[in-house]
Interface confidence: medium
C-alpha cells in the first residue's frame, strides 16, 4: 500500500529533526500526491495515445476544472494570502468529483488513485486549519456532483480516457501552483 | 528536433536595458514551463526567472525582482527577458532553458546562452 | 533559501578511475535534486533528475544517489569525454539554487 508522507524515513531531513510544521506537513502532503498523479499518469499514458495529444486540442473539452488565475492572489506578482487559500481550499474541493470519477478508472494503480483522493481529503482538513474566513469557502452542491459523476461516467471510452488525463494533468498544475503559493505564506 | 534559439545579448551601460529573446522549436511553450539560468563568468549557475504555462504566471530570484521582467508571444513560439537597470553584477551568459514535464523538476533543454555584458 | 554545497571544488582524476562527488542541502529536499554535466562555452545538459533517475540517452557509467539532504553523483569509470563541471540543483523550493560546481580534471 502507497505510505503516507512522514511515514517515509529517508524523507526525514535529520535523525534527529524537530516535528514537522503545519506547513511543512501541508508541503510535504502535497509533494505525496503528486508522486501518486504522476504514477497514474504513467498508466494512462502507456494506455493511450493521450499524453501526445496537444494542450491546444485537449483544451475543447467542457470540463470546468478548477484553475489559478491572477485575481486569486496565489501568484508571486498580487500574492494575497486570505484570498489564495480560500481559492486552493475552493479549487481542492471541486476537484473532489473529479477524483472520484477516476476512483475505477485504473487496474494496476487502483491503490494509487484510492491514496490521492484520500490525502486529498486529509490536505483539504490540514488547509481548512490554516483558513481565517471559513465562511469565503463554497462547496460544491452534491447533487450537481452526482450527475456531473453520472454523466462523465456515460462517456466513450476514448472520452473517458481523455478526460482521466486532463483531469490528472489539471490536477497536478493545480497542485504545483499552490506548492509554489504556500511556499509564500 | 526540439531545440531553444537565444538572441539580443551584447555590451550595455549600467542603468541600461536589454532585452533577450528565445524561440522555441519542436515543441510549444504554451504548454511548458520556461526558465532563464545565467553564469557570471568563471562561476557557477544562478536561477534568474521563470515562467510557468499553466497560468503564465512568473517568479524571479530576488536579485533581479523589479528590474527584469520574463514574458512569451504564443503565437510566435518565443520567450523573452526584458533587462532594466542594468547592473556590472548582471553581467554573465544568459540561458533559457525548458523545465521537463515532470514534477521532479529539471532543466531538459538548453539554449545555447547568449552573453551580455554590463560595462561603461 | 536552500544553499546547496559540492564537495570537493575540483577533483582529479585519470581514464577508468570511478569518482564520487557530493552535493548537500541545507535542509530536506526528498529526491528533488538534479546533476547537469557542463563543458567550456557549452551548455550545461542534465544527467540525472529525481536524484537517481538517468535522463534518457545518458551513459549507464554515471548514476546518481541519496534522499533528503545528502546526494552523490557516481562515475564508475571516467572516459576522456567525461572532464567537465559538475552542478547538483534543487528543484524543492523556489528560489532554486545550484550547488557551486565541481570541477572534474585530467591527474
Known amino acids: 500500500a502507497p505510505v503516507l508522507p512522514g511515514e517515509d524515513s529517508k524523507d526525514v531531513a535529520a535523525p534527529h529533526s524537530q516535528p514537522l510544521t503545519s506547513s511543512e506537513r501541508i508541503d510535504k502532503h502535497i509533494r505525496y500526491i503528486l508522486d501518486g498523479i504522476s504514477a497514474l499518469r504513467k498508466e494512462t499514458c502507456n494506455r493511450s495515445n493521450m499524453c501526445e495529444s496537444s494542450k491546444e486540442a485537449l483544451a475543447e473539452n467542457n470540463l470546468n476544472l478548477p484553475k489559478m488565475a491572477e485575481k486569486d492572489g496565489c501568484f508571486q506578482s498580487g500574492f494575497n494570502e486570505d484570498t489564495c487559500l480560500v481559492k486552493i481550499i475552493t479549487g481542492l474541493l471541486e476537484f473532489e468529483v473529479y477524483l472520484e470519477y477516476l476512483q475505477n478508472r485504473f487496474e494496476s494503480s487502483e491503490e494509487q488513485a484510492r491514496a490521492v483522493q484520500m490525502s486529498t481529503k486529509v490536505l483539504i482538513q490540514f488547509l481548512q486549519k490554516k483558513a481565517k474566513n471559513l465562511d469565503a469557502i463554497t462547496t460544491p452542491e452534491p447533487t450537481t456532483n452526482a450527475s456531473l459523476l453520472t454523466k462523465l461516467q456515460a462517456q466513450n471510452q476514448w472520452l473517458q480516457d481523455m478526460t482521466t488525463h486532463l483531469i490528472l494533468r489539471s490536477f497536478k498544475e493545480f497542485l504545483q501552483s499552490s506548492l509554489r503559493a504556500l511556499r509564500q505564506m | 528536433e526540439v531545440q531553444l534559439v537565444q538572441s539580443g545579448g551584447g555590451l550595455i551601460q549600467p542603468g541600461g536595458s536589454l532585452r533577450l529573446s528565445c524561440a522555441a522549436s519542436?515543441?510549444?511553450?504554451?504548454?511548458?514551463?520556461m526558465i532563464w539560468v545565467r553564469q557570471a563568468p568563471g562561476k557557477g549557475l544562478e536561477w534568474v526567472s521563470d515562467?510557468?504555462?499553466?497560468?503564465?504566471?512568473?517568479y524571479y530570484a530576488d536579485s533581479v525582482k523589479g528590474r527584469f521582467t520574463m514574458s512569451r508571444d504564443i503565437s510566435k513560439n518565443t520567450v523573452y527577458l526584458q533587462m532594466n537597470s542594468l547592473r556590472a553584477e548582471d553581467t554573465g551568459v544568459y540561458y533559457c532553458a525548458r523545465w521537463a514535464d515532470d514534477h521532479y523538476y529539471y532543466i531538459d533543454v538548453w539554449g545555447r546562452g547568449t552573453l551580455v555584458t554590463v560595462s561603461s | 533559501d536552500i544553499v546547496m554545497t559540492q564537495s570537493p571544488s575540483t577533483l582529479s582524476a585519470s581514464v577508468g578511475d570511478r569518482v564520487t562527488i557530493t552535493c548537500r542541502a541545507s535542509?530536506?529536499?526528498?529526491?528533488?535534486l538534479a546533476w547537469y554535466q557542463q563543458k567550456p562555452g557549452r551548455a550545461p545538459k542534465v544527467l540525472i533528475y529525481?536524484?537517481?533517475t538517468l535522463e534518457s540517452g545518458v551513459p549507464s557509467r554515471f548514476s546518481g544517489s541519496g534522499s533528503g539532504t545528502d546526494f552523490t553523483l557516481t562515475i564508475s569509470s571516467l572516459q576522456p569525454e567525461d572532464f567537465a563541471t559538475y552542478y547538483c540543483?534543487?528543484?524543492?523550493?523556489?528560489?532554486?539554487?545550484f550547488g557551486q560546481g565541481t570541477k572534474l580534471e585530467i591527474k
Open positions: 540543483q534543487q528543484s524543492y523550493s523556489t528560489p532554486w539554487t
Open positions: 529525481k536524484a537517481s
Open positions: 519542436g515543441f510549444t511553450i504554451s504548454s511548458n514551463y
Open positions: 515562467l510557468y504555462y499553466y497560468a503564465g504566471d512568473t
Open positions: 535542509q530536506g529536499i526528498s529526491s528533488w
